[in-house]
């Protein structure tokens, strides 16, 4: 089930500059780049029970993948 | 299912240049972080360094002036040379891609034994 | 390069047991409210496998014994009830920064 999106503004870095709906968060680049570009998770298969992870990594309310994978489990990534 | 495989001499003489390729199914290496790590017999892991989705890389500095990653897109492998290896390069090397956006190494390869001896 | 501490090196236990293994990174590993800390488990002659990712996350397909906590620069794998499957070598790994890196490796061994 998806969380509601948290702050971004982490303990050790200023939060970075919010990426549009499409792109995602590089942490090793620090920078907005296409989601495609990212091994970003696949939706899992029926029955899969993996917790979900408590937040990720895309500064957006949004999910920041594309339209094809807005059911990712995922908020978007910080 | 993402599948990484390792390949490459498992015998290299001092002085001389490793060479080892990682082939990939199941996903694209112009998506994402693809890594070396490597494990000396009996000893922990070191990681080596990525190529990325763009082709940048990055190289951990223990090593950095021996190592080059590359890749190969049209046959979705990636590369590593390591140069004037000696005795203390004998280890077991992965290659390894990690998820977004935990950066976590979730796929692994087997694992390929590489031994530097004259 | 943030390094990380982990104990004990190695330790003795029965199945049933619960075992509990620490993780201190030099420096925070948190960044952006995740805690980029992740557990691996190796057997001998095989890649290590994913447990827990993310501090506290199961890795595909991991068996709900393993659990992890912590955040900032202090880390906890737990296992609740030792299987026989479980005697292995477990790694703690940081993933805020490259170089990424490991710990040195606790060997769970039987009593």
């Known amino acids: 089930m998806r969380r509601g999106p948290r702050s971004l503004r982490g303990r050790d870095a200023p939060a970075p500059t919010p990426c549009v709906p499409a792109e995602c968060f590089d942490l090793l680049v620090r920078h907005c780049v296409a989601c495609g570009l990212l091994r970003t998770p696949r939706p899992k298969p029926a029955g899969a029970s993996s917790p979900a992870p408590r937040t990720a990594l895309q500064p957006q309310e949004s999910v920041g993948a594309g339209a094809g994978e807005a059911a990712l489990p995922l908020p978007g990534l910080l | 299912e993402v599948q990484l495989q390792e390949s490459g001499p498992g015998l290299v003489k001092p002085s001389e240049t490793l060479s080892l390729t990682c082939s990939v199914s199941?996903?694209?290496?112009?998506?994402?972080?693809w890594n070396w790590i490597r494990q000396p017999p009996g000893k922990g892991l070191e990681y080596i360094g990525y190529i990325s989705y763009s082709g940048s890389t990055y190289y951990n500095p223990s090593l950095k002036s021996r190592v080059t990653i590359s890749r190969d897109t049209s046959k979705n492998q990636y590369s590593l040379r390591l140069s004037s290896v000696t005795a203390a390069d004998t280890a077991l090397y992965y290659c390894a891609s990690p998820n977004y956006p935990f950066y976590a190494m979730d796929y692994w390869g087997q694992g390929t034994r590489v031994t530097v001896s004259s | 390069d943030i390094v990380m501490t982990q104990s004990p090196s190695s330790l003795s236990a029965s199945v049933g047991d619960r075992v509990t293994i620490t993780c201190r990174a030099s420096?925070?590993?948190?960044?952006?409210?995740?805690?980029?800390m992740n557990w691996f488990q190796q057997k001998p002659g095989k890649a290590p496998k994913l447990l827990i990712y993310a501090a506290s996350n199961l890795g595909s397909g991991v068996p709900s014994r393993f659990s992890g906590s912590g955040s900032g620069t202090d880390f906890t794998l737990t296992i609740s009830s030792l299987q026989p499957e479980d005697f292995a070598t477990y790694y703690c790994q940081q993933s805020k920064e490259v170089p990424w890196t490991f710990g040195q490796g606790t060997k769970v061994e039987i009593k």
């Open positions: 420096e925070s590993v948190d960044n952006y409210g995740i805690s980029f």
């Open positions: 199941g996903d694209s290496i112009t998506s994402g972080y």
